[in-house]
């Protein structure tokens, strides 16, 4: 019906306004409404001006119309020509009464379909229904996925790509781990993934200054070390260092009036030379204190070495050896005096004998046919050595003796000359001063070691070698190496160490093979004024130990492998060290600090005498131990 109406209107327009000229009223009759007429008539006049000369009145005039005028006028009522709609967005244009209607394609809106609908912002279809990314485009939209995801066939949802499955070798020697939208090449702790080589490379933590003092990097990790020999230990954080603190303070008070006889491991403590009138005779008086059973107290000789006198201790008793042109004698007598008490000793040359007194009571009288030392040129020249003798004398002794003596002397009077001159020398030298109070035992001050050569091979045993150790300890610091067996290649195949426990005021004992702890005895209260007794036995098959709390045979998966390492070392040559380690790498053992405190050691049934050591740090006291420091009311 509408199209018929349109055709009728078109016919009327042709007849009324093109074949003839029409005025506005006549045009109104064609359109039958004002809006279309008002829209049409001004444009109609423009067409007439374009194709006819002269001005037009409203009067009817007959004329030959041009074809161009026809097309001009016919176009006027079509609101869709020229196209008012947005070409991209419209689907169709409908002509209306002096108006038009643009029908939009999906995705467009507006009177002329000029506005794109943003489907991605549609509240009724959140994110355009896309699971990840919604991309709005003119007149449309599409979904897309983030990197590492692929589009599903519904064009809306995304699926994670499992790169590890796609290419199992994508991480090379590392482990591939798929994560949403990506993958990771994972390395064990202590390793970092190298993208170029597609492999896990060791992180050199040491280059990152992880440790306060010393750092040793190894594949997959690192270990911090502190210079135990300088008194440091590793802190709880396993990175920083802290001072090895004293857990049992000792009374280290000394007095310069007391001369320490064991200042040197090998050598004389004091050397004096006397030039006296020829009528003089040898005499020596002094107070003496020791727990040592053997050693040289003093040695005196003539200036030409032809005559000598040795005052020593053997088996805890005074021994005198003498030699001159007339005689050669050795005598031991009196009570045992290595009891840690002060004993007054006097040795005096009389006309026909040498008298030895302890506490003013004669214990020996040694006959002599003439003077001990022969005067020359009217003078008696005598050399006196404390706690030792010149090296060449060793071969001349009537009976060999270990000269080392851990003891003290005081109130000395030599050759009846008093102590003048000597005290001044001693006063300036701290290490010649003796401790005021001592107890029985051996003292390791935390600054050195003692070395022994011990043969651990036991031919009679099927095991081939064994190490049976008994330790009586009273530590003063909670960290240090008590005993170590060291191989020629600077490894430590076995060590017994002390470390401060994580639990307060207690210590752990570590047994280690090389740098691996094979057993840890935890939380023992060892820093007390009482000695602790520890025993352990080790051979190539077993490890047994006993502490104040328990006796046990240790067995764990790794032990046999560690004992095999020890076995290999024991078949070669090992040196035994007490109180610490020699110059081995810091990484050779779990602990490298010196032991500080008292300790007595028995190995394979033999009580070790530090005077018998191959070498010993001078500060180690072989037969005396400082007393525990007692708090006084004033202090």
């Amino acid at each position: 019906a509408n199209s018929l109406l349109e055709e009728t209107k078109q016919g009327n327009l042709e007849r009324e306004c093109i074949e003839e000229l029409c005025n506005k009223e006549e045009a109104r009759e064609v359109f039958e409404n004002d809006p279309e007429t008002d829209y049409f008539y001004p444009k109609y006049l423009v067409c007439l001006r374009s194709f006819q000369t002269g001005l037009f009145t409203a009067a009817r005039q007959s004329t030959n119309a041009y074809p161009d005028l026809r097309s001009c006028v016919n176009a006027i009522p079509d609101q869709c020509s020229p196209l008012p709609c947005n070409e991209d967005g419209y689907m169709s244009c409908k002509d209306g009464k002096a108006s038009f209607t643009c029908t939009c394609k999906p995705g467009w809106q507006g009177e002329k379909c000029e506005f794109d609908i943003n489907e991605c912002k549609d509240p009724s279809n959140i994110n355009g229904g896309c699971s990840q990314i919604c991309d709005n485009t003119p007149g449309s939209y599409h979904c897309s996925c983030k990197n590492g995801f692929v589009m599903l066939s519904n064009k809306k949802d995304c699926k994670d790509v499992d790169e590890c499955s796609l290419k199992p070798s994508i991480c090379g020697t590392a482990v591939c781990k798929n994560i949403p939208g990506d993958f990771e090449c994972e390395c064990p702790e202590g390793y970092r993934y190298n993208l170029k080589s597609k492999s896990c490379e060791d992180i050199d933590e040491c280059s990152e200054n992880m440790c306060a003092q010393l750092c040793v990097n190894y594949p997959g990790g690192y270990t911090c070390y502190c210079d135990g020999k300088k008194g440091f230990k590793l802190a709880q954080d396993q990175k920083s260092c802290e001072v090895v603190s004293v857990c049992l303070p000792l009374n280290l008070d000394t007095k310069y009036e007391l001369l320490y006889l064991a200042e040197q491991f090998a050598g004389v403590v004091l050397y004096l030379k006397f030039r006296l009138p020829e009528i003089s005779r040898f005499s020596a008086e002094f107070d003496f204190r020791t727990y040592d059973s053997e050693g040289v107290i003093l040695y005196a000789e003539s200036i030409d070495h032809s005559a000598w006198l040795l005052i020593a201790l053997r088996g805890g008793k005074i021994e005198v050896q003498l030699k001159n042109e007339h005689t050669s004698k050795i005598t031991t007598g009196g009570d045992v005096i290595n009891n840690g008490l002060w004993n007054m000793v006097s040795v005096e040359e009389l006309e026909h004998s040498i008298s030895i007194k302890i506490a003013k009571e004669a214990v020996m009288d040694i006959n002599k046919p003439g003077p001990l030392f022969k005067p020359e040129n009217g003078l008696l020249e005598t050399k006196v050595y404390f706690a030792g003798f010149p090296r060449k004398v060793e071969s001349e002794l009537i009976k060999p003796i270990n000269p080392r003596l851990d003891g003290c002397i005081r109130s000395w009077n030599l050759m009846k000359q008093g102590a003048s001159g000597i005290k001044e020398i001693i006063q300036e030298k701290q290490n010649k001063h003796c401790l005021v109070t001592v107890e029985k035992g051996s003292y390791y001050p935390g600054s050195g070691i003692a070395q022994f050569h011990i043969d651990y091979n036991n031919v009679s045993s099927a095991e081939g070698w064994h190490v049976n150790v008994t330790l009586n300890i009273r530590p003063s610091t909670g960290t240090g190496v008590m005993l170590a067996l060291v191989s020629g290649n600077n490894t430590v195949p076995f060590a017994v160490s002390l470390v401060d426990s994580t639990s307060e005021k207690s210590q752990d004992i570590l047994l280690s093979v090389e740098n691996t702890v094979i057993y840890r005895i935890q939380a023992l209260s060892l820093c007390s004024d009482q000695q602790s007794h520890l025993e352990f036995r080790v051979n190539r098959n077993n490890l047994e130990l006993s502490t104040p709390l328990k006796i046990e045979t240790i067995s764990h998966e790794d032990l046999q492998r560690q004992l095999a390492v020890l076995d290999k070392a024991m078949k070669a040559k090992v040196a035994t060290y007490l109180g610490g380690l020699p110059d081995v790498p810091f990484s050779a053992t779990p602990v490298n600090a010196f032991y500080n405190g008292c300790m007595e050691v028995n190995i394979n049934g033999v009580q070790l005498d530090l005077d018998e050591a191959i070498s010993k740090h001078n500060d180690i006291r072989a037969h005396s131990c400082p007393s525990v420091w007692k708090k006084t009311k004033n202090s």
Epitope: H142, S144, C145, K146, N147, G148, F149, V150, M151, L152, S153, N154, K155, D157, C158, K159, V161, E163, L166, K167, I170
Partner: antibody, heavy 117, light 113 residues
Framework: QVQLQESGPGLVKPSETLSLTCTVS????????WNWIRQPPGKGLEWIGY???????DYNPSLKSRVTISVDTSKNQFSLKVTSVTAADTAVYYC???????????WGQGTLVTVSS | DIVMTQTPLSSPVTLGQPASISCRSS???????????LSWLQQRPGQPPRLLIY???NRFSGVPDRFSGSGAGTDFTLKISRVEAEDVGVYYC??????????FGGGTKVEIK
């Protein structure tokens, strides 16, 4: 929407290398697995291989020794190279997008490559 | 590799009548993720293939509902309920369960009687 267009020479001499490029338009190259498929005249479809945008590839075992697929993400293109071609490599070569549902959602129009001297 | 076998090779059909194409795999196409990645493609004469069905039975966008897929494990079927003239062409089944190794069936030609 994503569209694919193959390009490359239509004639290759025997023993030479066949090289084709597929240009991806209207979408991200990271959103699909990109494949090459060929169809000899009058025959069925043969999968050649695929590439994922990070460079992961896999090939049909029967062609593996001669085929290389590469990707240029900056140009939104991926390419196919087949070495030592013979007349048996004459085919229409299609590039196609494989979705996460492992289906070929999008296909190029295909390009005929003739191997002849 | 999985081998895909299609039957029949050719299927002459009367317009408006149903058609059925079978596809069999040499081993189960059930993936470890539980999905079965079997799809159907249509290739009209002189045109590239286009996706019809994915994951056995899911119709791809724009595909008329006269196309349907069914099956499980190793046996699968594509059905056209009423064949139209525009349905003429070769139909391929394809497995992607073994992705990234993909294999096509040999194809079935659908023609009008």
């Amino acid at each position: 929407q994503v569209q694919l267009q193959e390009s490359g020479p239509g004639l290759v001499k025997p023993s030479e290398t066949l090289s084709l490029t597929c240009t991806v338009s209207g979408g991200s190259i990271s959103n699909y697995y990109w494949n090459w498929i060929r169809q000899p005249p009058g025959k069925g479809l043969e999968w050649i291989g695929y590439i994922y945008y990070i460079g992961i590839t896999d090939y049909n075992p029967s062609l593996k020794s001669r085929v290389t697929i590469s990707v240029d993400t900056s140009k939104n293109q991926f390419s196919l190279k087949v070495t030592s071609v013979t007349a048996a490599d004459t085919a229409v070569y299609y590039c196609a997008a494989l979705s996460g549902d492992h289906a070929f959602d999008i296909w190029g129009q295909g390009t005929l490559v003739t191997v002849s001297s | 590799d999985i081998v895909m076998t299609q039957t029949p090779l050719s299927s002459p059909v009367t317009l408006g009548q149903p058609a059925s194409i079978s596809c069999r795999s040499s081993q189960s196409l059930v993936h470890s993720d539980g999905n079965t990645y079997l799809s159907w493609l249509q290739q009209r004469p002189g045109q590239p293939p286009r996706l019809l069905i994915y994951k056995i039975s899911n119709r791809f966008s724009g595909v008329p509902d006269r196309f349907s897929g069914s099956g499980a494990g190793t046996d699968f079927t594509l059905k056209i309920s009423r064949v139209e003239a525009e349905d003429v062409g070769v139909y391929y089944c394809m497995q992607a369960t073994q992705f990234p190794h993909l294999t096509f069936g040999g194809g079935t030609k659908v023609e009008i009687k």
